[in-house]
């Protein structure tokens, strides 16, 4: 009643290993690490067989099959490459996830290397079974912005891709008779969020009252260079319009707002976000040079069709930029106090421009970002938003442009963008 001697499967073993197996003896077939028992198209960790009364084994010895992790999952804004020849997906094979550079960067700076584990899952040393996250790269235009040593007076044409965060905001307030139309600028913060000035998104229908425009009345254009040709631009409607709750229309304190886009926009050479500064009350230091871009829409009677389709009656069809130095708070405050008026340059504002004036102070559209290069992180950062002073007193002597100090609002911005009310949770990698 002895059963025949057993031969262990390739990449496997039999336990217990005996010289003789008699009736009722049982053996357990198992496979080496990275292999699984294959029996009748079923995969299992172990398989038990028994020596029967008639001297035969209850089952044939199964085979050991190498673990296969299968095709790796796709990565949003990224791609996967196989490190092993023939695109193998079996045990100990390697794959590498990478993000669509230079527009996306991997969160946590992981290697992106995943190995097929013995359990049949793609595994990373740090992230384990979780996939990496590709976040938008901010403040790194595909074209290098001009060095800031040379001073530019007045505006210069911006080459396509120099200010990929620049947004044109078009508002058509149909609740008014006649329909009201106006424009402003904004800056892309992520695939779904635009930063702008609150006054751009406030309806002037009621004085002394902050009435935000309806989201239905807002259109945002990104990747727009020449207002006469919007074919290459991405246009998006708004899902939410969020004005800072303390925005004051009398002195433009807290002049900051967000627009959440209806759908995330695809990033590319002409559409990339700007970085937010670190949350610090100081803001940019005096004499630091920053850039502001805008189409300088000077004629307010221009219609949406004219601006978007033909670009007529604007200061420039092509996006312009200007370089301006930050002015000390004390000097700016004094310059406005000397003008006799209810002007207050608060701690939530900073000023930029030249004492002798010039058209440079009015080129940036309201809501556009005043960007400064951060040497430490090697990114461009939105330190300010075009708020008041300059845009309406275009180039007057000793009338500095006043900008919203974005660093005072970083916590508020993140809070709003990550709140449950937001349609999506979004981050940006710096």
């Amino acid at each position: 009643n002895e059963c025949p001697k057993l031969q262990p499967p390739v990449y496997g073993k039999i336990e217990p290993s005996q010289a003789v197996y008699s009736f009722k003896d049982q053996v357990l077939v198992s496979c080496d690490t990275g292999y699984k028992v294959l029996k009748d198209n079923g995969v299992m960790d172990t398989f038990q067989i028994e020596c029967l009364k008639d001297g035969a084994w209850s089952n044939k010895i199964p085979t050991c099959k190498i673990v296969d992790c299968g095709a790796p999952a796709g990565l949003k804004h990224g791609l996967v490459t196989f490190s092993t020849r023939n695109n193998l997906t079996t045990y100990k094979s390697e794959i590498r996830y990478s993000c669509q550079q230079p527009y996306y960067k991997m969160l946590h700076n992981t290697t992106g290397v995943y190995t097929c584990s013995a359990h049949g899952t793609w595994t990373n040393e740090v992230l384990k079974r979780s996939l990496p996250t590709c976040l938008p790269v901010c403040g790194q235009p595909s074209r290098a912005l001009p060095n800031l040593v040379k001073r530019i007076i007045g505006g210069r044409n911006a080459e396509l891709g120099l200010f990929p965060w620049q947004a044109l905001i078009v508002v058509e307030d149909t609740s008014r008779v006649p329909n009201d139309k106006w424009f402003g600028s904004g800056a892309l913060l992520s695939e779904s969020w635009i930063l702008t000035a609150a006054h751009v998104l406030r309806s002037q229908r009621r004085d002394n009252t902050v009435i935000p425009v309806s989201k239905e009345h807002v259109t945002v254009y990104l990747g727009l260079h020449d207002v006469r040709d919007k074919s290459g631009a991405v246009n998006s409607s708004a899902a939410r319009v969020i004005l800072h709750p303390d925005f004051n229309i009398q002195n433009y304190n807290h002049d900051i707002a967000l627009v959440q886009l209806q759908k995330p926009v695809p990033l590319g050479a002409h559409v990339m976000p700007i970085c937010l500064p670190r949350p610090e009350p100081e803001g940019p230091a005096p004499h630091m040079l920053g850039l502001v871009a805008g189409w300088g829409i000077s004629n307010p009677n221009v219609t949406v069709d004219e601006i978007i389709l033909s670009g007529t009656r604007t200061l420039s069809d092509v996006l312009q930029y200007v370089k301006l130095p930050v002015v000390s708070h004390a000097e700016c405050k004094a310059s406005y106090e000397s003008r006799s008026g209810n002007y207050s340059v608060t701690e939530n504002m900073f000023c930029a421009g030249y004492y002798e004036g010039g058209k440079d102070t009015c080129l940036g559209d309201s809501g556009g970002a005043f960007v400064i290069f951060d040497e430490m992180s090697q990114h461009w950062v939105a330190q300010g938003l075009v708020s008041w002073g300059g845009p309406e007193e275009c180039g007057s002597k000793q009338v500095y442009g006043v900008y919203t100090k974005v660093s005072n609002y970083v916590d508020w911005l993140w809070e709003e963008m990550n709140s449950p009310r937001a349609v999506r949770d979004l981050q940006v990698e710096r």
Epitope: V171, R176, V177, P178, N179, D180, K181, W182, H199, Q204, R205, R206, D207, N208, T209, I249, Q250, N251, Y252, N299, P300, N301, R339, S340, G341, N342, Y343, S366, W388, P391, E392
Partner: antibody, heavy 116, light 112 residues
């Protein structure tokens, strides 16, 4: 501190055109609309309409549609009222007032006399 | 258009005495936003108008507290607790709720 300074008096003939200015100072100009109000000699006040100083879009009361035009020179912080094809009944003092509806500060008024 | 009716047409008051002006609108001035855009202004002789009261009862800065505004819906009142010489002129109410905004005919306050 907040001031609206209007242009001087005008003497015009019927059929001519007049353009009145209203220079604003002491506040953020594009934050408030600007209204225009007419006061005929010895009469009360009549609201003509307003202009959105941010968008430049004018809104006219029905009685002032056609010959009347509001415009802006934002960089000079100056709204304008233009009356075309003047008639004798346009003889009045014209005021600009800050705000589309609030009208919290008023200009000193511009007297327009239309006489042949 | 909303008709604004002011009474009386003329008011003769002795200095130090109270005065009251009524303003009635042909329809309610309560706006959909919950506010009532009823305002009062004073036009002194030979001068431009000056706003005194907005949103029915809010006093403009620099306006003496002897002025009070009250009312709701279609009936509004401006009261002066003790008239002073500088108060003479024509008082107008106006509404900013229904387009186009309309003024009352004015009430001339003269000193007895």
């Amino acid at each position: 501190q907040i001031q609206l300074v209007q242009s001087g008096p005008e003497l015009k003939k019927p059929g001519e055109t007049v353009k009145i200015s209203c220079k604003a100072s002491g506040y953020i100009f594009t934050s408030y609309g600007m209204s225009w109000v007419r006061q005929a000699p010895g009469k009360g006040l009549k609201w003509m309409g307003w202009i959105n100083t941010y968008s430049g879009v004018p809104t006219y009361a029905d009685d002032f549609k056609g010959r009347f035009a509001f415009s802006l020179e934002t960089s000079a912080r100056t709204p304008y009222l233009q009356i075309n094809n003047l008639k004798n009944e346009d003889t009045a003092t014209y005021f600009c007032a800050r705000g589309g509806e609030a009208m919290d500060y008023w200009g000193q008024g511009t007297s327009v006399t239309v006489s042949s | 258009d909303v008709l604004m009716t002011q009474t009386p047409l003329t008011l003769s008051v002795t200095i130090g005495q109270p005065a009251s002006i009524s303003c009635k609108s042909s329809q309610s001035l309560l706006d959909s936003d919950g506010k009532t855009y009823l305002n009062w202004l004073l036009q002194r002789p030979g001068q431009s108008p000056k706003r005194l009261i907005y949103l029915v009862s809010k006093l403009d800065s620099g306006v003496p507290d002897r002025f009070t505004g009250s009312g709701s819906g279609t009936d509004f009142t401006l009261k002066i607790s003790r008239v002073e010489a500088e108060d003479l002129g024509v008082y107008y109410c106006w509404q900013g709720t229904h387009f186009p905004w309309t003024f009352g005919g004015g009430t001339k306050l003269e000193i007895k």
